[in-house]
C-alpha cells in the first residue's frame, strides 16, 4: 500500500493522531495516539 503525508487542508483532521494518505485507497487515515480511538481519533478511552 502506497502511503504519504496528508495534504495541508487535512491539518486538524486527526484530533489526537497523525494523518496518513492511503494513496491506493484514495482516503485519509488517522494513526491514533495511545489512549485515543475513532476514525479521527476523537474518542478517549481509559
Amino acid at each position: 500500500v502506497s502511503i504519504t503525508k496528508c495534504n495541508s487542508d487535512m491539518n486538524g483532521y486527526c484530533l489526537h493522531g497523525q494523518c496518513i494518505y492511503l494513496v491506493d485507497m484514495s482516503q485519509n487515515y488517522c494513526r491514533c495516539e495511545v489512549g485515543y480511538t475513532g476514525v479521527r481519533c476523537e474518542h478517549f478511552y481509559l
Epitope: 504519504t4 495534504n7 495541508s8 487542508d9 487535512m10 486538524g12 484514495s26 479521527r40
Partner: antibody, heavy 116, light 106 residues
Amino acid sequence: QDQLVQSGAEVKKPGASVKVSCKASGFNIKDTYIQWVRQAPGQGLEWMGRIDPLRRNTKYREKFEGRVTITADTSTNTAYMELSSLRSEDTAVYYCVRSGTRFDFWGQGTLVTVSS
Amino acid sequence: DIQMTQSPSSLSASVGDRVTITCKASQDIHKYIAWYQQKPGQAPRLLIQYTSTLQPGVPSRFSGSGSGTDYTFTISSLQPEDIATYYCLQYDNLRTFGGGTKVEIK
C-alpha cells in the same frame, strides 16, 4: 451503500437567499469534510467552501466570503449551504462532495435558478 | 488562493490519437491533483487522484503525471466515448479547479 442526497430544485428572486441540504447515509459526516462546488450552465466547476462537521470549522473561497454559510447538523447527518443576496449569475447546479475518508464522493446536484 | 491554469480550453482529435492536457499550479501542490471527466447533464466522474492513481474501473488509456507545479493528463488512444470536458483539481490547500478542456472528435 454510501449516499449523499441533496434537496430539490429551487427558483429564487434576485436578492433572496437559498439553502440547499445534503443528507448523508451509510456513513457519519463527522468522519469527513463536506465540500460545496457549483457549476453555472455551460461553465466550469467552482469550489465554494467546506465544513469539518466534527470541529464545526469552515473555509470559504474568498469571492463567496460573507455571502455563503456552510453548516452541518450531526444529529441528522446533514450538511447545508446557504447563499444570500442572490443574483442571476448564481444560477447553477450546486453539489455537495464528501472528502476525507474517501476521495470525492458527489451528491446528485441541486439546480438553483435565480430569475425575476 | 492557488490558481490552476488548464490548457488547452478545447481540442479536436481523431479516434486513436494521443491527447494531452496540462495544468499549471501557481505554487507547489505536492502531487495533490485529481482529474475529472464530465459529460453533458452528468456529475463529474473522478478518473485519477494523487497525480497518477487511476480509480477502479477507469480504462488504462487514461494516465497522469507531474510534480511541483506542472501536471499532465493523457489519453493514450482517444475513443468515441471519451468525448467530454476534463477538469483538473488541486486539493493540497483547499481546492481549485482548472478551467476545463472540451475534447471533441475530428
